[in-house]
């Protein structure tokens, strides 16, 4: 039967009265402008809301902003604009919230022209109090917190100075001039690029990469001829200009830039780009753009050093530098990623990998769906997922795919069923097994969010008309109840729930539709009385992740091990609770060819687990550059997938020999690198 129509769908009793008692409206004394919302800390219930309103005057725009604070997950708000002296806050900098539960907040104020520097308001007590601080510079970027110490802040100035504070923004020091980009690394290290001649743009490809490990007391130049750099997992990447032409290559370091190796990736020209799609401590997914304005490139996956790469997926959709890609990490199941490819006929298709890029496949057609007009064969087609690209193309897609680490196996996304992504109005689909199987969950586009670690899914229909109804499901999207949360419909602008999907509160944001004036309004609904009791042992069932063939002893083995999870039964209406921890039982698997990626110079033909030599490299010695030395690779085509924990079984030979020969990578070799102190 269609979702929500079977006889099982009457389970949540008296929910209207329960929700009505737990629905809290707050009308903000604000004309509609823009609103931004930030959660301060984890499980604190503290929300900051900044509303800004621009009045267009003839010669300039006059702005005003208000700051509101809630400490009960959005049920009540207090106007605290007076704590920031009624100052207009610059929304482009947002609210800089400190890491973890530091309780730190930095707001950047608008200052009048001609002032010596900017102004910030700082709080270190979850926005109960703010201290005004005048800056000795005008900030160009939002203040960035060191991940290791929230008292350490960095910012770039409009004059390209790199400024650092060691006391949470009280005092600032310019540690370097002519800085283009700065990022915190691990251990309070700062990496930044500098220009020597004119500007960041003029010197692109001739920038220097610097490092300071002591907040600006001393520096080390760790790279020259830099185009850009990035950090991902434990890897530091730099794209470096080649000596002879305008091409550039990726270099990688795993020791904070002390030593570099040239990544075994194709070089790119001026109009092309590299992009780190995902990275963890084991490996990296790297996109390499194709020459020409194709809108696609190739995904490569790295070894554990980030040096040797295997081709993972061809014709990967990625429009332009800083453009759109649908690449999505499915955080609810290990090893799963979804993205889009551009077919030869220019249609867009969705692909999924369950083994961290080892093999990609189409998404299985949902059982309760028909193939649409894009399908040549009405009985054979796939699900295609709408993500960032569809949103950028202004298709009727209000949200990207959603998954949460503590809502195991659940993936929610807009999609269409056919041979390719359709421009028709999409429906919402859900997978409860990490993307292996899918079911149509809701007709038409919706906003959706996950509460109570998957115990509740909430959705709101995407409409150009005002709305007053919210839908919710307590059984992973099989059955839906509707609740009218207000008599007067509002123009809906967003759903907000505490990051981490552990909360049972959802805030519906919008603005009133009125004969007078529009005002911002929020409705916060607490579902605690819907899930009346705490979940017990009997409410959970054992689920084997990645299971495709229960008869097979190796069933569920992905990246060398299998995991059994305790998952909430769909029929159980109870609270996982804020302290819920995913219970999983891992067990090691025997190695098979599936546990190995194709080595440098090898590739896997489609639907084959064997790696074969790339025709153009047949009979050639496989040599590559590592830490400035030439290496010789002896391989029969396989290398262990980074993070793979398999033991025993298949064990392909792989050996790397140092050829004791120097090789250059257009980079400073360690002995040439210089240091300086302030």
């Amino acid at each position: 039967s269609a979702p929500g129509e079977d006889e099982e769908c009457g389970r949540v009793r008296d929910f209207v009265a329960k929700l009505a008692n737990n629905t809290h409206q707050h009308v903000f004394d604000d004309l509609r402008g823009s609103v931004s919302l930030s959660w301060v800390g984890d499980s604190t219930g503290v929300i900051l809301v900044l509303t800004t309103f621009h009045v267009p005057l003839v010669i300039m725009t006059f702005g005003q902003s208000k700051l509101y604070r809630s400490e009960d997950y959005g049920k009540n708000f207090k106007d605290i604009t007076d704590l920031i002296n009624n100052t207009f806050i610059r929304t482009e900098f947002g609210m800089a919230i400190g890491p973890e539960n530091s309780g730190k907040v930095v707001l950047t104020a608008e200052v009048s022209g001609g002032s010596r520097g900017g102004r910030i308001f700082r709080s270190s007590d979850f926005a109960k109090n703010f201290v005004q601080t005048d800056l000795p510079f005008h900030p160009l970027t939002q203040m960035m917190y060191s991940p290791q110490n929230s008292d350490y802040l960095l910012a770039l100035s409009t004059e390209n100075g790199l400024w650092v504070s060691k006391n949470f923004g009280g005092k600032w020091e310019e540690i370097h001039k002519a800085v283009c980009l700065a990022k915190w690394g691990s251990d309070n290290t700062i990496f930044f690029t500098t220009y020597a001649n004119g500007s960041c743009k003029a010197d692109l490809g001739a920038l220097e990469l610097w490092r300071t490990s002591d907040l600006g007391k001393s520096f080390k130049t760790i790279g020259v001829k830099i185009y850009s750099f990035g950090l991902g997992g434990r890897f530091l990447f730099a794209s470096v200009m080649a000596d002879k032409d305008t091409t550039r290559r990726i270099h990688v370091s795993t020791d904070q830039g002390d030593t570099w190796s040239m990544a075994q990736l194709p070089s790119v020209g001026q109009e092309q780009f590299y992009s780190i799609l995902a990275a963890n401590d084991d490996m990296v997914f790297m996109h390499v753009d194709e020459p020409g304005d194709t809108g696609f490139g190739t995904i490569f996956t790295s070894d554990d050093r980030g040096i040797v790469y295997s081709k993972s997926l061809d014709r990967h959709l990625y429009t332009t530098t800083g453009g759109e890609t649908d690449f999505t990490n499915v955080t609810s199941l290990r090893g799963v990623y979804i993205t889009s490819v551009l077919s030869e006929d220019n249609s867009i298709q969705t692909m999924i990998t369950f083994d961290q890029g080892g093999r990609w496949t189409h998404l299985r057609k949902p059982e309760n769906s028909e193939c649409d007009a894009t399908a040549k064969n009405k009985n054979e087609c796939s699900l295609h997922i709408h993500a960032s690209y569809s949103i950028s193309q202004k298709l009727n897609v209000p949200m990207a795919p959603l998954s949460e680490p503590n809502a195991v196996g659940i993936v929610i996304a807009h999609g269409s069923v056919g041979d390719a992504i359709s421009v028709m109005v999409p429906d919402v689909y859900i997978s409860d097994d990490g993307g292996y199987s899918w079911t149509k969950m809701l007709e038409g586009p919706h906003y959706y969010t996950i509460l109570d670690s998957g115990g509740i899914i909430v959705a709101i229909e995407h409409s150009s008309r005002p709305i007053n109804v919210i839908k919710f499901s307590t059984d992973e999207g099989q059955c839906w109840q509707t609740y009218t949360f207000t008599r007067d419909p509002i123009y809906f602008t967003g759903l907000a729930s505490e990051p981490g999907a552990r909360s049972m509160n959802i805030s519906i944001w919008g603005f009133t539709e009125s004969f007078l004036t529009s005002q911002w309004v929020s409705y916060t609904i607490d579902f605690k009385d819907i899930l009346e009791r705490n979940c017990e042992e009997k409410d959970y069932t054992i689920w084997l992740a990645h299971s495709t063939d229960p008869e097979d002893y190796e069933d569920g083995c992905i990246l060398g091990y299998k995991e059994q999870f305790l998952r909430l039964r769909k029929s159980s209406v109870c609270q996982n609770g804020r302290d819920y921890v995913v219970t999983k039982q891992p067990s090691i698997c025997l190695c098979s060819l599936e546990d190995f990626l194709c080595d440098f110079g090898y590739y896997r033909p489609e639907n084959d687990s064997k790696c074969v030599e790339q025709p153009e490299l047949k009979g050639h010695d496989l040599e590559f550059c590592l830490y400035g030395r030439e290496e010789h690779l002896t391989t029969n085509g396989y290398r262990k997938i980074p993070g793979d924990k398999c033991q025993g079984g298949v064990n392909p030979v792989r050996e790397v020999k140092d050829l004791k020969k120097k090789c250059t990578s257009n980079f400073l070799s360690p002995e040439k690198q210089n240091s300086k102190s302030n």
Epitope: R32, G33, P56, T512, E513, L516
Partner: antibody, heavy 118, light 107 residues
């Protein structure tokens, strides 16, 4: 400075149609309800129509219901009044007015004259 | 419909005088009344809303009072620019309805 400028008024025969426009400036148009009010030659005032901030709700008195339609284009900061099946008693100066957060008639336009006569 | 009866329809007064204009609603309107000013040959200006609240920029010599069905506009120390037409309007219920107007003339 908040400004409302009406246009489109004309001499029209009974049974005819006319579309009035009101161009708004100096405020955020899409956050305010808007109304049309007319002043007849004997100086009496009659409310004609009101539209909500996003155009979702409209309201009319019985005297014009079914004949007049109020609409708005928030992207162009413009309010409209489409009048059809016009009668001689529709002859008046037509004003657009902006709502504030408290009431419906805080700022008025300069007016445009509609004359319905054979 | 709520009938708004405004009186007087006209009055002649001198500069510096204090005048009151009244509006009676055919039923209670809970202070949902506003007052408008129209100068000769000009458009309208909002003066007072919710019975007693002055619009921004309106001089404090204007004041509103009343409750239930009876409301009044008072102008103290009349100045030259105050000679104009004044209208009340109720917005408690659809359709919104206006008083017949009061013409304030110089004696």
């Amino acid at each position: 400075e908040v400004q409302l400028v009406e246009s489109g008024g004309d001499l029209v025969k009974p049974g005819g149609s006319l579309k009035l426009s009101c161009a708004a400036s100096g405020f955020t148009f899409n956050t305010h309800g808007m109304s049309w009010v007319r002043q007849t030659p004997d100086k009496s005032l009659e409310w004609v129509a009101t539209i909500s901030t996003g155009g979702f709700y409209t309201s009319y008195p019985d005297s014009v219901k079914g004949r007049f339609t109020i609409s708005r284009d928030n992207a162009k900061n413009t309010l409209f009044l489409q009048m059809s099946s016009l009668k001689s008693e529709d002859t008046a100066m037509y004003y657009c007015a902006k709502s504030s957060s408290h009431w419906y008639f805080d700022v008025w336009g300069t007016g445009t004259t509609v004359t319905v006569s054979s | 419909d709520i009938l708004m009866t405004q009186s007087p329809s006209s009055m002649s007064v001198s500069l510096g005088d204090t005048v009151s204009i009244t509006c009676h609603a055919s039923q209670g309107i809970s202070s949902n009344i506003g007052w408008l000013q129209q100068k000769p040959g000009k458009s309208f200006k909002g003066l007072i809303y919710h019975g007693t609240n002055l619009e921004d920029g309106v001089p404090s010599r204007f004041s509103g009072s009343g409750s239930g069905a009876d409301y009044s506009l008072t102008i103290s120390s009349l100045e030259y620019e105050d000679f104009a037409d004044y209208y009340c309007v109720q917005y408690a219920h659809f359709p919104y309805t206006f008083g017949g107007g009061t013409k304030l003339e110089i004696k």
